[in-house]
C-alpha cells in the first residue's frame, strides 16, 4: 500500500539502485517515485553531514522485502517511494530554494526582475529542467537578478551548493505549466535523427510517448513497429534530443512512428503509468512472483498491488491453467520496461498501474458565512483539490468554498446551505482558478446527495461541516485532484505552514474576486482564540488561524474553503473555513472546522453502498 | 432572548451545604461555558469556577477549588454549584453568567447567607 | 496568581466631565482585560474587553487603552445614567477581578 511517513534522523542501509543530488527530501522522494526500481530513499541535508561530497545526497533504494534496516543518522531523512499513492504521485516540483544553487549546464543567461520570473523562463524553454536566480543583494553587482537556465544529463543537479542570495528551483512543465505547448501528432513511417539519451523496448508508440514525456531529457522519439525490418530492433522505442529541441531531421521509414514528449503540454499530461492490455503478446523480465488468478484483469491488479511488480505476462496455455485460473507472471526490469516482447503467443501482456494517479474511487487520508483578505492570486494546480460552489437561481453566483476529497465527494461548511439545501440549485466548478473562466459551456458537477452534520444547527457556529456527493465522479489532473485528510484527533502535529484560499471579499465590505486567492495564516492555539472570543465557544472542534495585527483572513464567499498545511511535503485539510468576527480584524482569528475530529463522521458517510469505505490511507 | 436565572441560595448554618442551580433559556448551555461568580456584601467580584457543559471540563479558582463543585444537565440547560463547608465568609450573591473567552451575560443573582 | 489593583476606589465627577479609571497587573497580561459596570442591585455588564474592544450595543463613550501591566478605562463624557461601580477583569491567566470603582455624580 501507499506510505507517506518520513523517519527523521534515519537512514536505510543498503539496497542502492542510483544517487543523485536533490535539494530537499520531498523532491528526493518524488525522484524515487518515478524510478523504476525505487522503493525507499535516503536524503542528507546540507546541515547532517560534513562531507561536500555527500551534501544534499539522495540515494535511492530497493528491497526485496520492501523494507532495510535503518541506522540513527542526525538531520538525514528516509521515506518510502510514492508508488501506489494515487494522487499524490506527481513530477510537479513548485518550491523555490533559498540560499542554494543548484549547479547544471548553463545554457542560457538572463537578467530579470525575480525569482518567479526565471522559473516562468525556465518552464517555457524546452531545454530548461531547472535554474538559479542570483537575487539584488548577491555579493557580486554583475551577477545580480541573472536567471540561469540548466540541465543534467539525469535532470537532477550535478551538484548542490549553499550561496546566499541564490534562489534555485525546477521547470514547473510537469506541472503542466509551459507555455510552449505540445505536439499531439503521431508520425507514422517517419524516423527522427538526434542523439539517443535512452533505449527501451515498448509494445506501441504510445507507451514510447509516455515513457520520453516522463524522462528528463527525452524531447521526442522514435519507435521501431513489431515488424520493423531488424528483428533486434523490434520495439525498440529510442528517446531523443537535440541542441535545437526540436528533430534536425527526419527520414521516411517503413515500420516506424515518431512523435513529441508531451511534457510541453499546457493544463494536461498524459498518466506516468500504461494501462492498456496487449492481447498476444508476451512481457519478459526477472521473475518476480507467479500465482494463479482469474483473467487478465485480476492479473494487472495483483501486479499494481505488488509494489515490485512493473509487467506482467497472463497466460492462457493450457499447462499453465488450472479450472478457471491460470499464471500470472509477475516481472521486472532495470528499467521498467520488458527486456524481450514476443508476439502471436497464449499470452496477455500489460503494466503495473502502481503510477497512475487516478488511484481507486476513494477519499484520502492519513493515520457566519466567512469569509481572503490580504492575500495574494494562486497560480494553475496550486491548490488543485479548490473547488467553488455556485447557485443558478435567476443568475448564478459563487457563494461558497469547498475542497475535492475524493473522485466524488466534496467537503465543505454546512452553513453554506442555510436557506438553500436543494441540491438542484448548485453548480460546483473543479479545476478553475478565474470564475470569469466560466461560461455556459464550461463542465460543472450537480449534486447527487448534501449531507449536512446531524449536530449543526442554523446560525450557530458548531459542527459546521457538509459532504456533498457529486452526482458523476471526477477525473484527476495536476488541476483537480483531492487534498489529504488529517488522521482522526490528529493534536499532535504542530503545522507551521498554512495557508486558507478562496474567490471571497478582499475587504469586509467588498464583492467576490475574480483569481483565486491565497494567504499564508499561522495557526493560534485553541486557548489564545477563546481570549479574543468573549461571547463565543471556541471548542476542540475548532481550529483557529490568524495574525495579531490582522489584514490577512478569510472573508465572505471563501466559507467551505479550505484550510490546508503542509506537513513533511504533504498538504492536509485541517480546516474547513467557517466563521470569525468580521475579516481580518485585529486579534479577531478566523474559525474553522476541525476537520480532524470529524474523521469518524466523514469516513461513515462516504461509505460505499456495498459496505466498503472509500478512502484510503497512505499512513 | 438570552437568559440566566439562579435559584437555591437561602439561609445556611456554618458546616452546611447548599446547591444553586442556574437555568438557561434562549441559548444551549452545551455551546457555551457556564461561569460562577461571587460579590460579597459590599466587596468586588470573585471567580469561583467554569463548565463545559459539553464535556463536563471544569476549572476552579484555586484558591476555592473544594470548596465548589459544578455540573451541568444539558437535557434541561441548567448548570449547578455545590457549596459545602460553608462559613460566614462565604456569605454572597452568587451569579452564573454564560461566554467564551469571558463573561459576556449574566443572572441576577442568588443570596446566600451563611449563619448561626 | 495575578493580582489587580485598580483605582481610584470612589470619584465624584459632573455630568459632561471625562472620568478615568486606571488598572494595574501585577503580571503582564497580553491585553486580556475586560472592563464591567454594576449599577446597585443589578448583574454586572460587560462594557470592553481586549484592552479596547467595545462589547455591541455599547455607547462609544467607553473606551479602553493600556498595554503590559498598566491599563485606563474612560468615559468621555459622564452621563447620569452611568453612575456605577467599574471593575476591572484580567482574564490572561484565570480570571482575577479590581477591587472596583464607584462612580457618583458631583
Known amino acids: 500500500g501507499c506510505l507517506t511517513q518520513l523517519y527523521e534522523n534515519a537512514f536505510f542501509r543498503g539496497g542502492d539502485v542510483a544517487s543523485m543530488y536533490t535539494p530537499n527530501a520531498q523532491y528526493c522522494q518524488m525522484r524515487c517515485t518515478f524510478h523504476p526500481r525505487c522503493l525507499l530513499f535516503s536524503f542528507l541535508p546540507a546541515s547532517s553531514i560534513n562531507d561536500m561530497e555527500k551534501r544534499f545526497g539522495c540515494f535511492l533504494k530497493d528491497s526485496v522485502t520492501g523494507t532495510l534496516p535503518k541506522v540513527h543518522r542526525t538531520g538525514a531523512v528516509s521515506g518510502h517511494s510514492l508508488k501506489q499513492c494515487g494522487h499524490q504521485i506527481s513530477a510537479c516540483h513548485r518550491d523555490i530554494y533559498k540560499g542554494v544553487d543548484m549547479r547544471g549546464v548553463n545554457f542560457n543567461v538572463s537578467k530579470v526582475s525575480s525569482v518567479e520570473e526565471c522559473q516562468k523562463r525556465c518552464t517555457s524553454n524546452i531545454r530548461c529542467q531547472f535554474f538559479s536566480y542570483a537575487t539584488q543583494t548577491f555579493h557580486k553587482a554583475e551577477y545580480r537578478n541573472n536567471c540561469l537556465l540548466k540541465y543534467s544529463p539525469g535532470g537532477t543537479p550535478t551538484a548542490i551548493k549553499v550561496l546566499s542570495n541564490v534562489e534555485s528551483g525546477f521547470s514547473l512543465k510537469p506541472c503542466a505549466l509551459s507555455e510552449i505547448g505540445c505536439h499531439m501528432n503521431i508520425f507514422q513511417h517517419l524516423a527522427f535523427s538526434d542523439v539517443d539519451v535512452a533505449r527501451v523496448l515498448t509494445p506501441d508508440a504510445f507507451v514510447c510517448r509516455t515513457i520520453c514525456t516522463y524522462h528528463p531529457n527525452c524531447l521526442f522519439f522514435t519507435f521501431y513497429t513489431n515488424v520493423w525490418k531488424i528483428e533486434s530492433q523490434r520495439n525498440v522505442c529510442l528517446l531523443k534530443t537535440s541542441e535545437s529541441g526540436t528533430p534536425s531531421s527526419s527520414t521516411p521509414q517503413e515500420n516506424t512512428i515518431s512523435g513529441y514528449s508531451l511534457l510541453t503540454c499546457k493544463r494536461t499530461l498524459p498518466e506516468p503509468c500504461h494501462s492498456k492490455i496487449y492481447p498476444g503478446v508476451d512481457f519478459g523480465g526477472e521473475e518476480l512472483n507467479v500465482t494463479f488468478v482469474k483473467g487478465v484483469n485480476v492479473c494487472q491488479e495483483t501486479c499494481t498491488k505488488m509494489i515490485r511488480c512493473q509487467f506482467f505476462t497472463y497466460s492462457l496455455l493450457p499447462e499453465d491453467c488450472k479450472e478457471e485460473k491460470c499464471k500470472c507472471f509477475l516481472r521486472l526490469s532495470m528499467d521498467g520496461s520488458p527486456t524481450r516482447i514476443a508476439y502471436g503467443t497464449q499470452g496477455s501482456s500489460g503494466y503495473s498501474l502502481r503510477l497512475c494517479n487516478t488511484g481507486d474511487n476513494s477519499v484520502c487520508t492519513t493515520k457566519t458565512s466567512t469569509r481572503i483578505v490580504g492575500g495574494t492570486n494562486s497560480s494553475w494546480g496550486e491548490w488543485p483539490w479548490q473547488v467553488s460552489l455556485q447557485v443558478k437561481l435567476t443568475a448564478q453566483r459563487h457563494l461558497c468554498g469547498g475542497s475535492l476529497i475524493g473522485h466524488q465527494w466534496v467537503l465543505t461548511a454546512a452553513h453554506c446551505f442555510d436557506g438553500l439545501p436543494l441540491q438542484d440549485v448548485w453548480r460546483i466548478y473543479s479545476g478553475i482558478l478565474n470564475l470569469s473562466d466560466i461560461t455556459k459551456d464550461t463542465p460543472f458537477s450537480q449534486i447527487k446527495e448534501i449531507i449536512i452534520h446531524q449536530n449543526y444547527k442554523v446560525s450557530e457556529g458548531n459542527h459546521d461541516i457538509a459532504l456533498i456527493k457529486l452526482q458523476a465522479p471526477l477525473n484527476y489532473t495536476e488541476f483537480q485532484k483531492p487534498i489529504c485528510l488529517p488522521s482522526k484527533g490528529d493534536t499532535s502535529t504542530i503545522y507551521t505552514n498554512c495557508w486558507v484560499t478562496g474567490w471571497g471579499f478582499s475587504k469586509e465590505k467588498g464583492e467576490i474576486q475574480n483569481i483565486l486567492q491565497k494567504v499564508n495564516i499561522p495557526l493560534v492555539t485553541n486557548e489564545e482564540c477563546q481570549k479574543r472570543y468573549q461571547d463565543y465557544k471556541i471548542t476542540q472542534r475548532m481550529v483557529c488561524a490568524g495574525y495579531k495585527e490582522g489584514g490577512k483572513d478569510a472573508c465572505k464567499g471563501d466559507s467551505g474553503g479550505p484550510l490546508v498545511c503542509k506537513h513533511n511535503g504533504m498538504w492536509r485539510l485541517v480546516g474547513i473555513t467557517s466563521w470569525g468576527e468580521g475579516c481580518a480584524r485585529r486579534e479577531q482569528p478566523g474559525v474553522y472546522t476541525k476537520v480532524a475530529e470529524y474523521m469518524d463522521w466523514i469516513l461513515e458517510k462516504t461509505q460505499s453502498s456495498d459496505g466498503k469505505a472509500q478512502m484510503q490511507s497512505p499512513a | 432572548e438570552v437568559q440566566l436565572v439562579e435559584s437555591g441560595g437561602a439561609l445556611v448554618k456554618p458546616g452546611g451545604s447548599l446547591r444553586l442551580s442556574c437555568a438557561a433559556s434562549?441559548?444551549?448551555?452545551?455551546?457555551?461555558?457556564i461561569f460562577w461568580v461571587r460579590q460579597m456584601p459590599r466587596k468586588g467580584l470573585e471567580w469561583i469556577g467554569r463548565?463545559?457543559?459539553?464535556?463536563?471540563?471544569?476549572k476552579y479558582d484555586p484558591k476555592i477549588q473544594g470548596k465548589a463543585t459544578i455540573t451541568a444537565d444539558t437535557s434541561t440547560d441548567t448548570a449547578y454549584m455545590e457549596l459545602s463547608s460553608l462559613t460566614s465568609e462565604d456569605t454572597a450573591v452568587y451569579y452564573c453568567a454564560k461566554g467564551g473567552g469571558l463573561f459576556a451575560y449574566w443572572g441576577q443573582g442568588t443570596l446566600v447567607t451563611v449563619s448561626s | 496568581d495575578i493580582q489587580m489593583t485598580q483605582s481610584p476606589s470612589a470619584m465624584s465627577a459632573s455630568v459632561g466631565d471625562r472620568v478615568t479609571i486606571t488598572c494595574e497587573a501585577s503580571h503582564d497580561i497580553n491585553n486580556y482585560i475586560a472592563w464591567y459596570q454594576q449599577k446597585p442591585g443589578k448583574a454586572p455588564k460587560l462594557l470592553i474587553y481586549y484592552t479596547s474592544t467595545l462589547q455591541s450595543g455599547v455607547p462609544s463613550r467607553f473606551s479602553g487603552s493600556g498595554s503590559g501591566t498598566d491599563f485606563t478605562f474612560t468615559i468621555s463624557s459622564l452621563q447620569p445614567e452611568d453612575i456605577a461601580t467599574y471593575y476591572c477583569?484580567?482574564?490572561?491567566?484565570?480570571?482575577?477581578f479590581g477591587q472596583g470603582t464607584k462612580v457618583e455624580i458631583k
Open positions: 463548565i463545559d457543559p459539553e464535556n463536563d471540563n471544569t
Open positions: 434562549g441559548f444551549n448551555i452545551k455551546d457555551t461555558y
Open positions: 477583569l484580567q482574564y490572561d491567566n484565570l480570571f482575577t
